[in-house]
């Protein structure tokens, strides 16, 4: 027999017993010991491992008068709500002195109807899209086989005949209900009912009919909607930023677009009220009573320029001898593009009509020839963009010059012996 | 049967490192804590501590504080212990034993003999 | 901590008298927690009584302990040669544990 005997002998009157139930059972693990001197704290183990956070509670009775008498320690585990994870091999452990102490074991099993780790979930899907749905069940009792429902009717011949975990849709064209059923020994576990809700295709190939200035006209090809027909479609439109800030994949544009609705058919619109000469993104998306489809892409465009909506502004012609000093200023309308110049016209009253390109320069000297002898003569000035002429500014008489007003140094120019255009208006 | 087997003699010099192991069998390893026990030459017995061999949880006593330590290697049912910084009042012979519920040692380890010298 | 003062520390006997040898404690302990060892020359000492009146296995039975509070004591009712050793007893009332320093008991 081994030295020191007494290190062989459990304290453990009592062992925990065996647990089997259904999932969310309520059930409690007792042990017992009988202990000399002052009772010891008892650990609960599940497969070996001690519970940190166990609902125990653990009751000591003294048995004698002296604290050196034996105690009577009871300790009951509970489990509440019963979960796979709580399932295994159970027992108590006290430290008593130098040497621990386990229990025997007791077991705690599930068994009962099949459980969903994964259900069906509501979606949105295109019209004739695939798509796929999940289910997983698990007991025990394994196995569990699932059935799959399509709008309250089975898809297959029996449980675990058809789609397991996974189910393929190929395409739906109305909104449908999905649900599974898992069957095992114990009975038959319903999933929840997912609805998957069939939306209009995106549109495809959104594109420019025609350019205008201020606006655009831009068409599309409406996607399947299933038995659902489209009520409308909604263009949005935003500033490009010069190309910069929206990529084709980007959610959201960089400010507020503008939003225009479009009755349809046809699946056109005209946007309006843009700016000219503008880098623009447009996207479009199509909705029908179950709801919109996802938009397209940004589609970059442009508004081509305009001309000047407006003639140069604050003209001034002064007339010294045989020279002449015009100048003016921007015009205070919009150009609609980049300003590439300015034309100026002047005509005397017997003479006719002399046409220059001045340039960006926004003041001019002009030779005159006959040294002062063309009477009433008048200067027109209008600016000019790639997209052609403004409007004209009214005819300017050149005023003789005082001594006292500024007239700076400017290059001159001759004036051509023919007239280079002529206006119908004059 | 039971046995706790130590490592062999050591000669050390002092401000060395000494680790001795206390290799056991026959029992649950982590059922019974080990106690080390020194012994100076024509001395008594002196305890230095315990490890609880479930837990891994060393216990020292106040003269072993500081350059001793505890530790276990559970899979090979070993203990060990490390004495660091050694000086010549370590020279002794170290038991390692196990310990019961009633703080008794019942089984001893053969000893191991520390000679310390410069 | 619980210093225990053993006494004689060196006693001397002839084969077949009975001797008792003593272990005071500084403060009381259970009787469950004092222990004898036997230590042998060159030896590793061994359990030889627990919670002071039980024989280790293997221990003759002309070996006795008894004892509470803070006095304990050893006896042997009829010494042999082979009883030659040191006997150390041995405390826990809290850490650290602590052994007494030795009672040494010759056989003539």
């Known amino acids: 027999a081994p030295r020191g005997t007494q290190a062989e002998e459990s304290p453990f009157v009592g062992n925990p017993g065996n647990i089997t139930g259904a999932r969310g059972l309520t059930g409690t693990l007792r042990c017992q010991l009988q202990v000399q001197g002052e009772p010891p704290e008892v650990h609960w183990l599940r497969d070996g491992q001690i519970l940190e956070l166990a609902d125990s509670t653990q009751t000591q009775v003294p048995l004698g008068e002296d604290e050196q008498d034996d105690w009577i320690v009871v300790s009951q585990l509970r489990i509440t709500s019963l979960q796979l994870s709580d399932t295994g091999q159970y027992q108590c452990l006290v430290f008593l002195g130098h040497q621990t102490f386990v229990s025997q074991p007791g077991y705690v099993g599930l068994e009962g109807l099949p459980y969903f780790l994964e259900e069906p979930e509501d979606r949105t899907v295109a019209a004739n899209t695939p798509f796929n749905l999940s289910c997983q069940a698990q007991g025990p009792p394994e196995p569990v086989d699932l059935l799959w429902l399509q709008d309250a009717v089975p898809l297959a011949t029996a449980p675990g005949h058809g789609p397991q975990r996974s189910l393929h849709v190929p395409g739906l064209n109305k909104t449908s209900s999905f649900s599974c059923e898992a069957h095992n020994a114990k009975g038959v576990t319903t999933s929840r009912t997912a609805t998957i809700t069939v939306l209009p295709q995106q549109p495809r190939n959104l594109h420019l009919v025609s350019r205008q200035p201020t606006e655009l006209e831009v068409a599309w090809t409406p996607g399947l909607s299933g038995i659902y027909p489209l009520t409308h479609c909604t263009l949005q439109a935003v500033l490009s930023d010069d190309g910069m800030g929206i990529q084709a994949g980007e959610p959201d544009p960089p400010e507020e677009p503008l939003t225009s609705q479009a009755s349809v058919p046809p699946h056109q619109l005209r946007l309006g009220s843009l700016h000219p000469h503008t880098p623009y993104h447009i996207r479009v998306a199509c909705t029908s009573s179950q709801g919109p489809s996802s938009w397209t892409h940004w589609l970059p465009v442009e508004t081509p320029e305009g001309v000047p909506l407006g003639p140069p502004e604050n003209i001034s012609a002064t007339r010294n001898g045989s020279q002449a000093f015009v100048h003016w200023q921007e015009p205070r309308a919009p150009l609609q593009g980049t300003l590439l110049g300015y034309r100026l016209a002047y005509q005397g009253q017997d003479t006719p009509e002399v046409l220059m390109d001045i340039g960006l320069r926004q003041e001019v000297t002009l030779e005159l020839q006959g040294d002062g002898s063309v009477s009433n003569l008048t200067v027109c000035v209008a600016a000019y963009t790639a997209a052609g002429d403004g409007p004209w500014s009214l005819p300017v008489p050149l005023e003789a010059w005082r001594p006292g007003q500024a007239q700076p140094v400017h290059q001159l120019v001759k004036e051509p012996s023919t007239p280079a255009f002529s206006w119908p208006w004059w | 049967q039971i046995q706790l087997v130590q490592s062999g003699p050591e000669l050390k010099k002092p401000g060395e490192t000494v680790k001795i192991s206390c290799k056991t069998s026959?029992?649950?390893?982590?059922?019974?804590?080990i106690n080390w026990v020194k012994q100076a030459p024509g001395k008594g017995l002196e305890w230095m501590g315990w490890?609880?061999?479930?837990?891994?949880?060393?216990t020292y006593a106040d003269d072993f504080k500081g350059r001793f330590a505890f530790s276990l290697e559970t899979s090979a049912s070993t203990a060990y212990l490390q004495i660091n910084n050694l000086r010549d009042e370590d020279m002794a012979t170290y038991f390692c034993?196990?310990?019961?519920?009633?703080?008794?040692?019942?089984?001893w380890g053969q000893g191991t003999a520390l000679t310390v010298s410069s | 901590q619980n210093v225990l003062t053993q006494s004689p520390a060196i006693m001397s006997a002839s084969p077949g008298e009975e001797v008792t040898m003593t272990c005071r404690a500084s403060?009381?302990?259970?009787?469950?927690?004092l222990h004898w060892y036997q230590q042998k020359s060159g030896a590793s000492p061994k359990l030889w009584i627990y919670s002071t009146s039980k024989l280790a296995s293997g221990v003759p039975a002309r070996f006795s302990g008894s004892g509470s509070g803070t006095s304990y004591s050893l006896t042997i009712s009829s010494v042999e040669a082979e009883d030659a050793a040191t006997y150390y007893c041995?405390?826990?009332?809290?850490?650290?544990?602590?052994f007494g320093s030795g009672t040494k008991l010759e056989v003539k």
């Open positions: 490890i609880n061999t479930y837990l891994g949880e060393p």
């Open positions: 041995h405390q826990y009332s809290g850490d650290p544990l602590t």
């Open positions: 403060s009381s302990v259970s009787s469950s927690y």
């Open positions: 026959g029992y649950t390893f982590t059922y019974y804590g």
């Open positions: 034993t196990r310990g019961t519920m009633s703080y008794s040692f019942d089984y």
